[in-house]
């Protein structure tokens, strides 16, 4: 058993049918010694008397808010949550496996640049009685500070007969050095509590591996005289790291016909312009990627040919 926060405790339970459970001793936070009784949640049934209460925690029915009283007055509370292990594996029931980039991916994180700021998100089908708390650091043995905000509900989606809820959090490395080579990964830890169930989820990554630039901005077409060709130009996104001479991007320019089946013409360039043939009813799209490190491509920025 360990303390999650004041008066909230997590009992780690290795569960299997007929498991003996965990013996937990609760102590009433009071100088009083006599006439103390214990109850669980809203029930008035007296579970025991005395300054301490010993319970055997075998299942969620044994978890909840234990309260000690004297003469009708509440003396203190202890909320017991369960962290369940089955077959040697901690439960991961609260969050959905996003299965990308691999199975058992519960947290996904992205950074728009090298400033040390990043966003993580996760999915759940649970709509109520749910709280999250996020901590982060660079490295784990001698951790350097990363400050995370509060997790917020960022999207709701309907998936078949089910609703899916996306939560996200923004974090900022306290002393980020954008140009430095990373040697220690960022660690992100999410505590999730649903009703009386506690679970924790972790992710470890280098900022360079989670970079996903914003799409190029100010995408424009300039027709070339007496030609079907156009000059496409764009700019680095505002959110990308500066100077651009050091934090350089490479770009992919794509000409896509109205039909998805039509052949796509693609050009790769390090410049912020390219010359392409603009077909009728086609659109031109440009996306960006770090020039020197193969992290994610940005989403496409698009304009119609017409």
């Amino acid at each position: 058993i360990w303390e999650l926060k004041k008066d909230v405790y997590v009992v780690e339970l290795d569960w299997y049918p007929d498991a003996p459970g965990e013996m937990v001793v609760l102590t009433c936070d009071t100088p009083e010694e006599d006439g103390i009784t214990w109850t669980l949640d809203q029930s008035s049934e007296v579970l025991g008397s005395g300054k301490t209460l010993t319970i055997q925690v075998k299942e969620f029915g044994d978890a909840g808010q234990y309260t000690c009283h004297k003469g009708g007055e509440v003396l203190s509370h202890s909320l017991l949550l369960l962290h369940k292990k089955e077959d040697g594996i901690w439960s991961t029931d609260i969050l959905k496996d996003q299965k990308e980039p691999k199975n058992k991916t519960f947290l996904r994180c992205e950074a728009k640049n090298y400033s040390g700021r990043f966003t993580c998100w996760w999915l759940t089908t649970i709509s109520t009685d749910l709280t999250f708390s996020v901590k982060s650091s660079r490295g784990s043995s001698d951790p350097q500070g990363v400050t995370c905000g509060a997790a917020t509900l960022s999207a709701e989606r309907v998936r078949g007969d089910n609703k899916e809820y996306e939560y996200s959090v923004e974090c900022q490395e306290d002393s980020a050095c954008p140009a430095a080579e990373e040697s220690l990964p960022i660690e992100v830890m999410v505590d999730a509590v649903h009703k009386l169930k506690y679970e924790n989820y972790t992710s470890s990554f280098f900022i360079r591996d989670i970079i996903k630039p914003d799409p190029p901005k100010n995408l424009q077409l300039k027709p070339l005289k007496n030609s079907r060709q156009v000059e496409v130009s764009w700019e680095y996104p505002d959110t990308w790291s500066t100077p651009h001479s050091y934090f350089s991007l490479t770009f992919c320019v794509q000409v896509q016909g109205k039909s998805k089946r039509e052949k796509k013409d693609r050009v790769f360039t390090d410049k912020t312009s390219a010359t392409v043939i603009c077909r009728k009813n086609a659109s031109i799209s440009v996306r960006a990627q770090d020039r020197y490190y193969s992290s994610s491509w940005s989403e496409w920025a698009s304009v119609p040919c017409s």
Partner: nanobody
Framework: EVQLVESGGGVVQAGESLRLSCAAS????????MGWFRQAPGTEREFVAA????????YYADSVKGRFTISRDNAKNTVYLQMSSLKPEDTAVYYC????????????????WGQGTQVTVSS
């Protein structure tokens, strides 16, 4: 919302078997832990059995261990309770319940309930 409808109850002789079914509709059935409870006249609702959302883990009340088997078919959105070697003291209304906390024998840890199906065991 999850809607639960029990079926399969009836009158049987002691020592016989019965299979209860609980059909779920509404939100994704496979996200929920499922349980069976029962209530005899003049008594509190009593835990019978529970099954995890994956169906890989089951939990039983001591009074039914070895006689009752809970199972589920997530493709059919159905949970079953196979009851054998029935005794007169198994007579009760049997309720199906869905929740997110497994294992739990406490009724208020379940969020959704069916209307119940009567099982009568005569001696």
């Amino acid at each position: 919302e999850v809607q639960l409808v029990e079926s399969g109850g009836g009158v049987v002789q002691a020592g016989e078997s019965l299979r209860l079914s609980c059909a779920a509709s509404g939100r994704s059935f496979s996200d929920y832990e499922m349980g069976w409870f029962r209530q005899a006249p003049g008594t509190e609702r009593e835990f019978v059995a529970a099954i995890s959302w994956r169906g890989s883990s089951t939990y039983y009340a001591d009074s039914v261990k070895g006689r009752f088997t809970i199972s589920r078919d997530n493709a059919k959105n159905t949970v079953y309770l196979q009851m054998s070697s029935l005794k007169p003291e198994d007579t009760a209304v049997y309720y199906c319940a869905a929740g997110r906390l497994y294992p739990s024998s406490r009724s208020r840890d379940y969020d959704y309930w069916g209307q119940g199906t009567q099982v009568t065991v005569s001696s």
